[in-house]
Interface confidence: low
């Protein structure tokens, strides 16, 4: 019977998750006389195979980061090896899984901020990359501050934009940072994929050293 897994030779598109060890055939093409065998060409990468009887399958896990689409062609041949049908395009779309970790571009960042700077105004960006598809949660990154040292009165002086990695002062930081009291701070920043929303997300951390500089501008006396 013809159905999801079998049918005549025609252009088709299949979606397969990367990383999936082979666990089913892709399709069984049915030969119409005088066709007796099938031939596969294109971007097979020695992964995609078609048996003479028309059974199309793959023999090892796909990797989207190596090739996100495999463009194949299938032709039906007669007993003399002459193409009698096709070749028709068969497209394999490789769907993304979360198989790559986000990685900070630097293991250590350094920056400076002037005391009394406007809260929310970025003075430093941390940046991470993830090879997974950014159009899926697998490649969507979420930045956060894990530790601020020193932490005075349990008050956070720094904040980070969870999506962009932009570091800026909080309202308290803008008001209270004083290089005479504490000229430097260290932040540990983490980045998670899956938009930070999954216990299965991967993460990375980086260190940020921040120097607080004196605000040399003085308000004019009345």
């Amino acid at each position: 019977q013809e159905g999801k897994f079998s049918g005549p030779l025609k252009p088709m598109t299949f979606s397969i998750y990367e990383g999936q060890e082979p666990s089913q055939i892709i399709f069984q093409f049915k030969a119409n006389p005088p066709a007796v065998t099938f031939e596969l060409t294109g971007e097979t990468d020695n992964i995609f195979v078609i048996e003479r009887e028309g059974l199309l399958y793959y023999n090892r896990a796909l990797d989207r980061e190596t090739r996100s689409t495999h463009n194949l062609q299938v032709a039906a041949l007669d007993a003399n090896g002459i193409i009698v049908e096709g070749p028709v395009p068969i497209t394999i779309k490789v769907k993304d899984i979360n198989d790559n970790r986000p990685t900070f571009l630097q293991s250590k960042y350094e920056g400076s901020v002037r005391q009394n700077s406007r809260p929310g105004k970025p003075f430093l960006y941390v940046n991470a990359t993830d090879l997974d598809d950014p159009a899926t949660p697998n490649g969507q990154l979420y930045y956060q501050i894990v530790i601020q040292l020193p932490m005075i009165n349990n008050v956070m002086y720094f904040q980070i934009n969870n999506k962009t990695g932009a570091i800026s002062l909080t309202r308290e930081g803008s008001q209270e940072l004083n290089p005479a009291k504490n000229p430097s701070y260290n932040l540990v920043i983490s980045v998670k994929d899956m938009g930070g929303q999954s216990e299965n997300s991967f993460s990375d951390t980086t260190s940020v050293d921040i120097i607080v500089t004196e605000n040399i501008w003085k308000a004019p006396k009345p």
């Epitope: 999801k4 897994f5 998750y17 990383g19 999936q20 060890e21 082979p22 666990s23 089913q24 055939i25 023999n59 090892r60 896990a61 899984i97």
Partner: antibody, heavy 118, light 106 residues
Framework: EVQLQQSGPELVKPGASVKISCKAS????????MHWVKQSHGKSLEWIGY????????GYNQKFKNKATLTVDSSSSTAYMELRSLTSEDSAVYYC???????????WGQGTSVTVSS | QIVLTQSPAIMSASPGEKVTMTCSAS?????MHWYQQKPGTSPKRWIY???KLASGVPARFSGSGSGTSYSLTISSMEAEDAGTYYC?????????FGGGTKLEIK
């Protein structure tokens, strides 16, 4: 809690058939493929085949192609394996095991012992 | 089919001892999976995707390897680790298991 509850032990005569069941609970049945594995007494494991999670397509180890038939009833979250033309070589413990493409067979049934004897 | 050969077939280790068992594949495979089985019970997923520990598996276990050579290591043997360990490949049909390594406590 994920559970795979298999039917009880079977004592059958040579040449007969037997149908083993594996009832799943604690997860969405159609999200996972169900595999079947044979373990002869004191021996290693042999993969029989699997039934694809939501449409009944199945794949077999060629060795068992004419021995086992795998079916599924999604409405009752139950997978079945029928063994036919039984001989003493088929006496073994048969396991069902849940499988997702990432991460091997993570939950196994308790096993069903099949003894073929006249 | 891909044949998985486990060695040794039987081994014993004292508590605290480091244990390594190997699994050799007749052809290159993508990942190796390992199961633990104790007498009278079902196999349990132990290590999957070559090196990932299944839920509840102690951190003293580790898995490694690539191509045709894989291994399971216990950094410090404990009595509860005794059992039979099977390697398993799903990279090529038919899926196959190794003959098992029976690990006993001295």
């Amino acid at each position: 809690e994920v559970q795979l509850q298999q039917s009880g032990p079977e004592l059958v005569k040579p040449g007969a058939s037997v149908k083993i069941s594996c009832k799943a609970s604690g997860y969405t049945f159609t999200d996972y493929n169900m595999h079947w594995v044979k373990q002869s007494h004191g021996k290693s494991l042999e993969w029989i085949g699997y039934i694809y999670r939501n449409n009944g397509y199945n794949g077999y180890n060629q060795k068992f192609k004419n021995k086992a038939t795998l079916t599924v009833d999604s409405s009752s979250s139950t997978a079945y394996m029928e063994l036919r033309s039984l001989t003493s070589e088929d006496s073994a413990v048969y396991y069902c095991a849940r499988n997702y493409w990432r991460g091997a067979m993570d939950y196994w049934g308790q096993g069903t012992s099949v003894t073929v004897s006249s | 089919q891909i044949v998985l050969t486990q060695s040794p077939a039987i081994m014993s280790a004292s508590p605290g001892e480091k244990v390594t068992m190997t699994c050799s594949a007749s052809s290159s495979i993508s990942y190796m999976h390992w199961y633990q089985q104790k007498p009278g019970t079902s196999p349990k997923r132990w290590i999957y995707d070559t090196s990932k520990l299944a839920s509840g598996v102690p951190a003293r276990f580790s898995g490694s390897g690539s191509g045709t050579s894989y291994s399971l290591t216990i950094s410090s043997m404990e009595a509860e680790d005794a059992g039979t360990y099977y390697c398993h490949q799903r990279s090529s049909y038919p899926w196959t298991f190794g003959g098992g390594t029976k690990l006993e406590i001295k």
